[in-house]
Structures are given as structure tokens and as C-alpha cells.
């Protein structure tokens, strides 16, 4: 049977804005991912800034409703925003417990949804896990 | 097919601890919360925890906070739980779980001087 | 915690008999995703407990079509159609909405 859906849960230092209300904090410790136990969507969420080559997790967490892109299995990120020259902000949704944990790939910021061979890369088969 | 196979039972001293295994076949380990449950004798059922294997991320019943460890061994995708401290109180049967689908067959603890 | 109060305590029947098993909360188990997180378990004599329902009304596989879940909010039944000799043992409710989970405290079907 399903669980309430469980994802990790980390907002950078001086990110505007909070989605820690959008569930309830597991009490993990402090060597876990932290983990966050959805109240309104069945969906996690995932933002990762890429500047130079180099991706920086953002925020991660619960959605606040179940939209399109949540069926999905995995953390596929598109480019969404360029918050500053030369930076671009990564976002993906995905309905499976912690899959907003790592991404297996970015796709190239100058074409959306697109995959490509810029970024950082997992080698097959590996996904680059965040390091909370 | 999916199958959960739990440690034999065990007869152990009070205030002794006592831990059991529950090794997981026929599916991808790491995908499924792993649950455990205690029954006492002749009484209904009772949540104590559950553990993600792919992070070790778990979530207790606030009343088994302190008595129950949870743990995994990916490698040979088993789940553990330690009791520690028994009392008479803690005799009982232990199931674990696949996120509450499939069951192992119980692990019967007997808590006795 | 949740409460999860389940009638009759026990239920003698006659093979072939419809039985039904009420499951009453003491809170709502809709969760805020839309999702009841309701199940119900059969345990037979000497056995592990084994999931025959979840989400209220959805049967687990190998489940037969005669074992009928329902309900919303706080009020939950499971329908026997037509009872037969391995349906015999104890009922439980189970919820996983709130925390911690909880079950009832089980309605065991015998026969008269």
C-alpha cells in the first residue's frame, strides 16, 4: 500500500521563502538527508542552480498539489529561470519517495527540456547524489 | 516472488537487549519502506517504525523512541531491528513488513529471567 | 493517537453468509493529498497478518472479489459477500494517515 509520499527536505542559507510548511519534518538526526512527509500532493520537488559548470542544490521538498510532471518516476530537471548572468535554475518534479534526492542528469541550460552534454554528467547507470 | 524471511526466536534475560533480522527477496530492496509491528500475546497489533533502505531515513512510533534501532544492510538487503532493555513487557511476536504488503513470518520474543 | 474502533469484537457466521465489519475513527483519515490512508488485514490461526485491502476499497492482488471495502472520513466497513472455510480468523483495521499508525483492535469471524 502507499505511504504518505516522504522526500528530502533542504532550503540553501538565505533562500527566500519556505516549503517547510508543505509537510511534516521526520526527526532523521544529523548524518540523514533531511526528510520531509508531504501534507498536500504526493509530489517532491527539487531546484539546483548551475553556474560554470558546477550545480548547487537549491531547495527540495514537498509540492504543494499534484501537477503535471509529478507521475514521474524520477528527478529529470528542465532549466527554468536565469536568476543571474551566467547561472540558470533547474527544477524537476517526481512522485516516488526521496526521488528528489539526485538528479541522473541536466539537461543543457540554453535548451529547455532538451538533453544535452553540458553540465555536470553521471556516468550510465550513476546519478549525481546531492551532498545536503 | 516477494519474500520476507525473519531470524529465529529468541529467549533473553530482562533488561538484556535482543536483535533480529528480516532479509528481503524477490524485489528491489532499497524501493520499499520496510515496517515493523509487534504483537502481543493475544492482543491486536501495534506500529513500532519504518526505515527507507535506500537512506536509512526512519520514522518511529513515539512510544518505541528508545526501546527500537532500526538498521539496513543493503548489501544483502536485510532489515534489523534491536530491542533494548527488555522487560516481561516486551514479549511478544515481531513482524516486519514491505511497506505492509507482504509480512515475514514473525520472530517470537520471550523475555524471561 | 489515533483511535480505531472496530464492531462487532467477534462475528459467528454460517458459510455461504454475508458478514460485515465496522471500522470507526476517531479522526478523519482523509489526508491532505486527497488520499485515505485505510487498510484492512486478515490474520489466520498461526499465521502472519496478510493485507486484503488498502485505500479504503482497493483490493490487494489475489484478493477474491467477495472480500468489499468502503467508506469515507471516519466510518469504514469491510463486506464479506459470501463466506468461506480461509476467511475464518481476525480482522484488523489499519490506518496510516496520522502518526503514529494504529490498528483496531481486531473482529475475529468464526463459525457457529
Known amino acids: 500500500p502507499p505511504n504518505r509520499r516522504t522526500c528530502v527536505f533542504f532550503e540553501a542559507p538565505g533562500v527566500r521563502g519556505s516549503t517547510k510548511t508543505l509537510g511534516e519534518l521526520l526527526d532523521t538526526g544529523t548524518e540523514l538527508p533531511r526528510a520531509i512527509r508531504c501534507l498536500y500532493s504526493r509530489c517532491c520537488f527539487g531546484i539546483w542552480n548551475l553556474t560554470q559548470d558546477r550545480a548547487q542544490v537549491e531547495m527540495q521538498g514537498c509540492r504543494d498539489s499534484d501537477e503535471p510532471g509529478c507521475e514521474s518516476l524520477h528527478c529529470d530537471p528542465s532549466p527554468r529561470a536565469h536568476p543571474s548572468p551566467g547561472s540558470t535554475l533547474f527544477t524537476c518534479s517526481c512522485g516516488t519517495d526521496f526521488c528528489n534526492a539526485n538528479y541522473s542528469h541536466l539537461p543543457p541550460p540554453g535548451s529547455p527540456g532538451t538533453p544535452g552534454s553540458q553540465g555536470p554528467q553521471a556516468a550510465p547507470g550513476e546519478s549525481i547524489w546531492m551532498a545536503l | 516472488q516477494v519474500k520476507l524471511l525473519q531470524s529465529g526466536a529468541a529467549l533473553v534475560k530482562p533488561g538484556a537487549s535482543v536483535k533480529m533480522s528480516c532479509k528481503a527477496s524477490?524485489?528491489?530492496?532499497?524501493?520499499?519502506?520496510v515496517s515493523w509491528v509487534k504483537q502481543s500475546h493475544g492482543k491486536s497489533l501495534e506500529w513500532i517504525g519504518e526505515?527507507?533502505?535506500?537512506?536509512?531515513?526512519?520514522n518511529f512510533n513515539e512510544k518505541f523512541k528508545g526501546k527500537a534501532t532500526l538498521t539496513v544492510d543493503k548489501s544483502t538487503s536485510t532489515a534489523y531491528m534491536e530491542l533494548r532493555r527488555l522487560t516481561s513487557e516486551d514479549s511478544a511476536i515481531f513482524y516486519c513488513t514491505r511497506q505492509r504488503d507482504y509480512w515475514g513470518q514473525g520472530v517470537m520474543v520471550t523475555v524471561s529471567s | 493517537d489515533v483511535v480505531l474502533t472496530q464492531t462487532p469484537g467477534s462475528l459467528s457466521v454460517t458459510l455461504g453468509d454475508q458478514a460485515s465489519i465496522s471500522c470507526r475513527s476517531s479522526q478523519s483519515l482523509e489526508y491532505g493529498d486527497g488520499y485515505t490512508y485505510l487498510e484492512w488485514y486478515l490474520q489466520k490461526p498461526g499465521q502472519s497478518p496478510q493485507l486484503l485491502i488498502y485505500g479504503v476499497s482497493n483490493r490487494f492482488s489475489g484478493v477474491p472479489d467477495r472480500f468489499i471495502g468502503s467508506g469515507s472520513g471516519t466510518d469504514f466497513t469491510l463486506k464479506i459477500s459470501r463466506v468461506e472455510p480461509e476467511d475464518l480468523g481476525v480482522y484488523y483495521c489499519?490506518?496510516?494517515?496520522?502518526?503514529?499508525?494504529?490498528f483496531g483492535a481486531g473482529t475475529k469471524l468464526e463459525l457457529k
Open positions: 524477490g524485489y528491489t530492496f532499497t524501493d520499499y519502506w
Open positions: 526505515i527507507y533502505p535506500k537512506n536509512g531515513v526512519s
Open positions: 489499519f490506518q496510516a494517515t496520522h502518526d503514529p499508525n494504529t
